[in-house]
């Protein structure tokens, strides 16, 4: 009931708790001498459902039949309205609409660990919308019974607080849950189980790993388990992998040897336990152990390439480059690279350890036959050395690949194609495609990239260290024994018109013609490979179309003569540059007047 109901009563029939779809009768009646002063026939009783009027009656009582109430709680309040005064609250009632409980389903019980307590869960079924009490009952051998009640609004779990022990692991226990509310009751089907069925072991703990003689091939995993554990599942994976390796072991007694781990790899290990071959459930997985396996000596061989540069009549510069071993080949942290340079006829050799980078430059005589060997070393040993005889890679003209082309292939890729050399193509043992950013000064500090291609291939897609709007000098080498031939081309993955034209820095007169000199366009403004320069000129103050001269682009060229200018006429000159995408804006303008005699 709501408030003290001093002035009257509200009664609800058949009950304050009703089944969904039922009808209730609500009666509001005034107590004696609680009506409107003087005029009892002017008593107006009004029935509210929440804050809306739903019925009224003049007199001492009001009877109202109510249908269609929704699930949940509905509040009814009865008020008295007298002439010329505010309504007075008489009394009220809450009506609870719900359903009888459904049969609880999927009752299952578990004891976490040998020392844990029995707890059960079930599915309640649809919400009753009413206060519903759940009673869980467990009966065991020797007529032992335990009971626990739950009065939470949403009850689907109860812990008996008792511990089943392994003295008689085959003894049967039966659990049942009963739901009761004002509209009915329902019991689950009984669930019968033994100790072995419901005890779920605690996950293993104190997991450790040992590598005998710091070797990955002699690895043992150790852990601790509850006393009755019979089975274990081990799972392990490299930390950067999503796929687990799984091993099932019986009577492991807290240790297992792992034979297939990779060296120098961080692994994650987890273990789970079970008490019986086919009864009960697996424990949760243990906390992860993360451990790095020991190093092993590197496998595989370095991919080595080189460049030769003429210094003077007696000396040459050799630059060696090599690629890092893959993680699976390095099998550890590479501490240094060992480079051995040897003159083959004289037997002189020098060895150097290189740390921190993957290149080495030295100067050697131009005479003699030279060879290099490069290997990678970690804490356990060295890779097999890669041996290379130093030769003139472009000496054999007949081995030069033909019709080399370089075309953009999607984002930041260049497709290089070629035809085999004229000399017997079957003599080619491999092709090497080499690329580096084009720098007008021929800067040897620019990083070198290369890839190897089988002798039957006539194309290669280069994508490593390729940037948009940068021109690359690309060489294709055909190697055969101790001979090599090469061809080169310029290429870019993406291009647009250059951002600026060349800057004319000087115009000089020579025997009736002029020589124009210019500064190269900065690399970052070229926007790809330059194809041509154009020199424009026209008479000053003239509205005529300018004349032009187009010069094919060559890396080292930065001057060009023009001999079609008239003497004693002042000309304005400027330059532009072109890529395959178009022409740059004008460079600076220069005026010049040829002083030579008129013809």
């Amino acid at each position: 009931k709501i408030d003290a109901c001093k002035r009257g009563d509200v009664t609800v029939k058949p009950s304050h708790v009703i089944l969904l779809g039922s009808t209730v009768n609500i009666t509001c009646s005034l107590k004696p001498r609680q009506g409107c002063f003087h005029y009892s026939r002017r008593n107006k009783l009004i029935l509210y459902k929440f804050d809306r009027r739903i019925n009224f009656h003049h007199g001492h009582s009001l009877n109202s039949q109510v249908t269609g109430l929704p699930l949940g709680t509905t509040l009814f309040v009865c008020k008295l309205a007298c002439i010329n005064s505010d309504e007075i609250q008489i009394c009220g009632a809450e009506i609870f609409v719900g359903v009888a409980p459904e049969q609880p389903q999927n009752l299952s019980c578990i004891q976490k660990g040998e020392q844990g307590t029995v707890a059960c869960t079930w599915e309640r079924g649809r919400d009753t919308h009413l206060y519903t009490e759940y009673t869980l009952q467990l009966s065991g051998p020797k007529n032992l019974t335990w009971q626990k009640q739950c009065k939470d609004i949403y009850c689907d779990y109860l812990d008996f607080g008792i511990n089943l022990t392994p003295e008689s692991p085959e003894s049967n226990f039966t659990a049942k849950v009963t739901a009761v509310n004002s509209l009915g009751s329902s019991s689950s089907l009984p669930s019968t189980f033994t100790f072995l069925d419901i005890v779920r072991p605690l996950p293993p703990w104190d997991i450790r790993i040992k590598f005998q003689k710091a070797s990955v091939s002699r690895c043992t995993l150790y852990w601790r388990d509850e006393g009755l554990v019979l089975l274990n599942r081990l799972r392990y994976r490299p930390s950067n992998s999503r796929l687990w390796n799984m091993v099932n072991v019986t009577k492991a007694k807290g240790r297992h040897d792992l034979l297939d781990l990779k060296p120098f790899t961080e692994y994650e290990f987890q273990i789970s336990s079970k008490l019986h071959l086919y009864k009960g459930s697996w424990s949760d997985w243990s906390e992860s152990l993360r451990a790095q396996t020991p190093e092993e000596e590197p496998t595989g061989m370095l991919d080595v390439w080189y460049m030769k540069r003429h210094i003077d009549y007696s000396r040459q510069q050799i630059s060696l480059f090599w690629k890092n071993l893959s993680v699976s080949e390095a099998r550890g942290k590479i501490l240094h690279y060992q480079v051995t340079l040897q003159e083959l006829t004289g037997g002189k050799a020098m060895t150097q350890n290189i740390t921190g980078h993957t290149s080495w430059t030295t100067v050697i005589p131009r005479t003699g036959n030279w060879a290099v060997a490069v290997s990678a070393a970690n804490s356990k040993g060295s890779s097999l050395p890669t041996r290379i005889n130093i030769m003139n890679l472009c000496e054999a003209g007949l081995l030069a690949p033909r019709q080399v082309s370089a075309n953009s292939e999607g984002m930041d890729n260049i497709l290089v194609t070629w035809q085999p050399p004229r000399k017997d193509p079957s003599a080619v043992q491999e092709y090497v495609v080499e690329w580096r950013e084009l720098h007008p000064g021929g800067d040897t500090q620019v990083p070198l990239n290369w890839l190897r291609s089988r002798p039957y291939n006539v194309s290669a897609l280069i994508s490593e260290n390729i940037k948009s709007y940068i021109c690359y000098e690309i060489r294709v080498y055909a190697l055969s024994g101790d001979q090599g031939g090469c061809s080169s081309i310029l290429g870019n993955s993406k291009h647009k018109a250059p951002l600026s034209g060349p800057h004319i820095n000087a115009i000089t007169e020579e025997k009736g013609s002029i020589l124009i000199s210019w500064n190269s366009i900065p690399v970052q403004e070229q926007m790809g490979c330059l194809l041509h320069y154009r020199i424009y000129w026209k008479e000053r103050d003239s509205n005529s179309q300018p004349q032009l001269c187009e010069i094919p682009y060559r890396v080292s060229q930065n001057s060009h003569p023009i001999n079609s200018l008239q003497p004693r006429v002042t000309y304005v000159l400027w330059m532009t540059a072109l890529t395959a995408a178009g022409e740059s804006s004008h460079g600076n303008e220069r005026e010049f007047c040829l002083q030579g005699k008129a013809n």
């Epitope: 009808t23 009027r53 019925n55 009224f56 109202s64 039949q65 109510v66």
Partner: nanobody
Amino acid sequence: QVQLQESGGGLVQPGGSLRLTCVASGFPFSTHAMSWVRQPPGKGREWISAINSGGDSTDYADSVMGRFTISRDNAKNTVYLQMNSLKSEDTAAYYCAKYEDCSDYDCSSRASWGQGTQVTVSS
């Protein structure tokens, strides 16, 4: 769903009479109090009368007291409004509604109103 169908409106001279009828369906009529509401042209709605679920108590707005009579027949799911001594200010569209949606206390909900019937009082 709730349906209310009004009828009986028309053109009548001042001082004349009309009887409006409202037939209800889609809900248990006998358990619901009912109201009549009107809306003069260009004005807001005005509750004018109500009858409780049993038909034994009625209420009227002061503007129609003594001239209008509300009644119901639960067997026919019907509520009536007998209008006598009509005046020109009674000209309006007349609607019936469930009392819980429109009473002298609160007539803000149009959830269960019918389509209405037009009453015009004019000479």
